[in-house]
Interface confidence: low
């Protein structure tokens, strides 16, 4: 049978060498980090203007408030991505007008409308996971024929101590996949 290259797991979206998962349920910011961790990904860290435009469009199209991997939890007023990199000055243009305002301990960043907003980290919102796309030069599980594969299983024992909370989430993702067949 013909073998097709699928650089991303089923239900993930490919863009410029990376795979993105737009959640269909909501979690607080910390738990969103862990949800991404459970599937070998990271709460989205934006590296380019093109990536920002792509993600903002995904979020605004669905009219959802969506967590990204950006916060000033480490030091008030100093925004940092979850991979440890600082928020570059060139990215500050993406804040909505008057944001970040830190009203009432708003330490985590979300996609909101056509830009970014800071909000309370304990609020439940949608989230976006990001991981590198699979190379199509190797015979990996993303090579599919004829039907798409299920999402990559999470690494054994991972989850930053929240495995129990996210068992249900992982089941939901798998069920969501199967319902589309």
């Amino acid at each position: 049978t013909e073998r097709l290259c699928h650089p991303c797991p089923w239900e993930w979206t490919f863009f410029q060498g990376n795979c993105y998962f737009m959640s269909n349920s909501q979690r607080n910011w910390h738990d969103s980090i862990t949800a991404c961790k459970e599937v070998g990904a990271q709460l989205v860290v934006i590296k380019s203007a093109e990536e920002q435009n792509f993600l903002q469009l995904q979020s605004s199209r669905s009219n959802r408030f969506t967590w990204m991997g950006l916060s000033d939890l480490n030091q008030e007023g100093t925004w940092q991505w979850v991979d440890g990199s600082p928020l570059l000055p060139s990215f500050k243009q993406y804040w909505n007008r008057g944001e970040p305002n830190n009203v009432g301990e708003e330490d985590c960043a979300e996609f909101s409308g056509n830009g970014w907003n800071d909000d309370k980290c304990n609020l439940a919102k949608f989230w976006i996971c990001k991981k590198s796309a699979a190379s199509c030069s190797r015979d990996e599980e993303q090579f599919l024929s004829p039907a798409p594969a299920t999402p990559n299983p999470p690494p054994a024992g991972s989850g930053g101590g929240l495995n129990d909370i996210f068992e249900a989430q992982k089941i939901e993702w798998h069920e969501h996949h199967h319902h589309h067949h």
Partner: antibody, heavy 119, light 112 residues
């Protein structure tokens, strides 16, 4: 800067419930996980569990049926309840901020409160 | 549960000399995101523990640069380049990869 202060009775009778509260000052309770750790005299540290919201908790399975943690955001406090205590639960109890999967580590810690289980 | 094993359990050191503490886990603490979920704490006599190193090798705020953490997977090391008198206490490692988070037994550092 964030500071934590444990409070609660220092003496609890066997089979009763141990109740401790940790008050957070200098910062909001709503952005982090909060954890409880205990240490019997002269022994090592044991992780009891952590709470983010009252609906989002993780407990040590060794204590799971006996422990409950909750958060009161209006008072900037979180609490620990341990049911059916025995002498083995006698320990110094610490509360700490768990910086979560992104930052990592427990920091800061409270100064600890000694709980003795005895009749 | 993940079991954490520290060695040595007692460590007499001369001031100014280096010191090294080992921590081993029963399964890998390296996640696919590149982080090692291993932290180090120091509990000075009569005090609460204090965070020294988080995520394997990151020094916590205010921790002197004579402290360093290294290692990956199952084998980790805390090093003190030049021990000072104020470094005495019990050092603990902890895995934070999965609940229940588990501590090592502790290593007591004392001055010779």
């Amino acid at each position: 800067q964030v500071q934590l202060q444990e409070s609660g009775p220092g003496l609890v009778k066997p089979s009763e419930t141990l109740s401790l509260t940790c008050t957070v000052s200098g910062g909001s309770i709503s952005s982090y996980y909060w954890t409880w750790i205990r240490q019997p005299a002269g022994k090592g540290l044991e992780w009891i569990g952590r709470v983010f919201t009252s609906e989002s908790t993780n407990y040590n399975p060794s204590l799971k049926n006996r422990v409950t943690m909750s958060v009161d955001t209006s008072k900037n406090q979180f609490s620990l309840r341990l049911n059916s205590v025995t002498a083995a639960d006698t320990a110094m109890y610490y509360c700490a901020r768990d910086r979560g999967t992104y930052l990592g580590g427990f920091d800061p810690w409270g100064q600890g409160t000694l709980v003795t289980v005895s009749s | 549960d993940i079991v954490m094993t520290q060695s040595p359990l007692s460590l007499p050191v001369t001031p100014g000399e280096p010191a090294s503490i080992s921590c081993r886990s029963s399964q890998s603490l390296l996640h696919s995101n590149g982080y090692n979920y291993l932290d180090w704490y120091l509990q000075k006599p009569g005090q609460s523990p204090q965070l020294l190193i988080y995520l394997g090798s990151n020094r916590a705020s205010g921790v002197p640069d004579r402290f360093s953490g290294s290692g990956s997977g199952t084998d980790f090391t805390l090093k003190i380049s030049r021990v000072e008198a104020e470094d005495v206490g019990v050092y603990y490692c902890i895995q934070a990869l999965q609940t229940p988070f588990t501590f090592g037994q502790g290593t007591k550092l004392e001055i010779k």
